[in-house]
Interface confidence: low
Amino acid sequence: GWVWNQFFVPEEMNTTSHHVGRLRSDLDNGNNSFQYKLLGAGAGSTFIIDERTGDIYAIEKLDREERSLYILRAQVIDITTGRAVEPESEFVIKVSDINDNEPKFLDEPYEAIVPEMSPEGTLVIQVTASDADDPSSGNNARLLYSLLQGQPYFSVEPTTGVIRISSKMDRELQDEYWVIIQAKDMIGQPGALSGTTSVLIKLSDVNDNKPIFKESLYRLTVSESAPTGTSIGTIMAYDNDIGENAEMDYSIEEDDSQTFDIITNHETQEGIVILKKKVNFEHQNHYGIRAKVKNHHVDEQLMKYHTEASTTFIKIQVEDVDEP
């Protein structure tokens, strides 16, 4: 019968002919009366056989990622009789893997949005690289992920490519981060190949800033002839948050005279000081009131950022009008 060994040929061989192995019948006594033949796809072009000895050689560079195995047929003939010594038999030559492919991130570009001030350990996104080398062949396609850029705010799980927050971030200081992840094959050992990808991580706003008055003192004037409902001036606070989180409401905190009111212009986020009761220069020529400002929407769990409302003092001077 046939004496079989497993046949392997390393991919990307740079020798002109590589000895793959030998076909042999146990009836072959070495007196050169047998002739070995190779048939099938690749026979005669990729693989040749020494008909006398049965030695098979690869004469082309092979790429495992293109084709990982060749199925060939073997024949052995007794040249004195022209008859087959063994039944024709199918066998396989496997192309063995070398680490000739770097990891590639196929789903680029990566982009993620995560709320600012998210706690350590919050999952941001998972990046995945693929390696065309053989996953069953050593560590050629076993990947390790690492962070090239993004410390100290982000970390990556070495085996999964899961990016997590490792330090709280404040959108008001920086609203987006470019993280660069490297994937290395050979589990990072010497000779490893690597690929990189960039991840744009945008921070969404949370209401972690209270509105603060731009000025601690405002000076306004009102004519004693002004009717109730007159707008006598505006005050303004700023809030480092954006959108709904920056919407604010102004109100009177202190006005013993109950002469003034403040309404909020929700388009401009200004407070408009309104005359609630008519004033009389001869009766009182100046007033001091205190206004406060608060956010319109505050989540229960963010109340710690909004404990004390910002206040401002408003001095209002009454202008005299000549009376008949």
Partner: antibody, heavy 120, light 111 residues
């Protein structure tokens, strides 16, 4: 009222290390950053670094990188600052100062200071 | 050499108004809140002004802070003898990723 109580004065030889402690009380220890600031005799204030006690995240001033280690113990509400390879110019009063809930918010409470003298 | 520049000394007579300046750059004063600390002789620093112009409770309204662009200033009106101290500005610096203090200003109240 927030309190920060620091360990007592130390005298060290050049090349040695010193570890100063700062015990915090009357606030939620894990919510606030803690900084260390030093002041050499007759000199100004110099920021050394900052730690967030909950995760142990630290940022050190470039000048002290490699020589300073800041740690926190949440079970005792204490932060520590260790300075190694001491030299005479490290003679200073070392203060711990409570920061805000964000890295860039002011230091509102300070410890009483710990005098470290480096002398052969 | 401090990242924030303050005059080394300032003086005034009781009742006068004194201003102390603090000059920085875009990465510090230009990007973040300025804070001021008062250090009385032989004591730990004390927060005097925070977030540019806010006073902690217990700080008299004679002390006020302001900021414009990359500079800030501390004003003390109605100067009193107990105001004699060292004053420091401090701010978080984005490019250094850390805090910076001014060199300090020694305020003398002349009698």
């Amino acid at each position: 009222q927030v309190q920060l109580v620091q360990s007592g004065a130390e005298v060290k030889k050049p090349g040695a290390s010193v570890k100063v402690s700062c015990k915090a009380s009357r606030y939620t220890f894990t919510s606030y950053y803690m900084s260390w600031v030093r002041q050499a005799p007759g000199q100004g204030l110099e920021w050394m670094g900052i730690i967030h006690p909950s995760g142990g995240d630290t940022t050190y001033a470039q000048k002290f990188q490699g020589r300073v280690t800041m740690t926190g113990d949440t079970s005792t509400s204490t932060v520590y600052m260790e300075l190694s390879s001491l030299r005479s110019e490290d003679t200073a009063v070392y203060y711990c100062a409570r920061g805000g809930i964000k890295l860039w918010l002011h230091f509102d409470y300070w410890g009483q200071g710990t005098l470290v003298t480096v002398s052969s | 050499q401090s990242v924030l520049t303050q005059p080394p000394s300032a003086s005034g007579t009781p009742g006068q108004r004194v201003t102390i300046s603090c000059s920085g750059s875009r990465s510090n004063i230009g990007s973040n809140f300025v804070n001021w600390y008062q250090q009385l002789p032989g004591t730990a620093p004390k927060l005097l002004i925070y977030t540019n112009n806010q006073r902690p409770s217990g700080v008299p309204d004679r002390f006020s802070g302001s900021k414009s662009g990359t500079s800030a200033s501390l004003a003390i009106s109605g100067l009193q003898s107990e105001d004699e101290a060292d004053y420091y500005c401090a701010v978080y610096d984005e490019s250094l990723q850390g805090w910076v203090f001014g060199g300090g200003t020694k305020l003398t109240v002349l009698s």
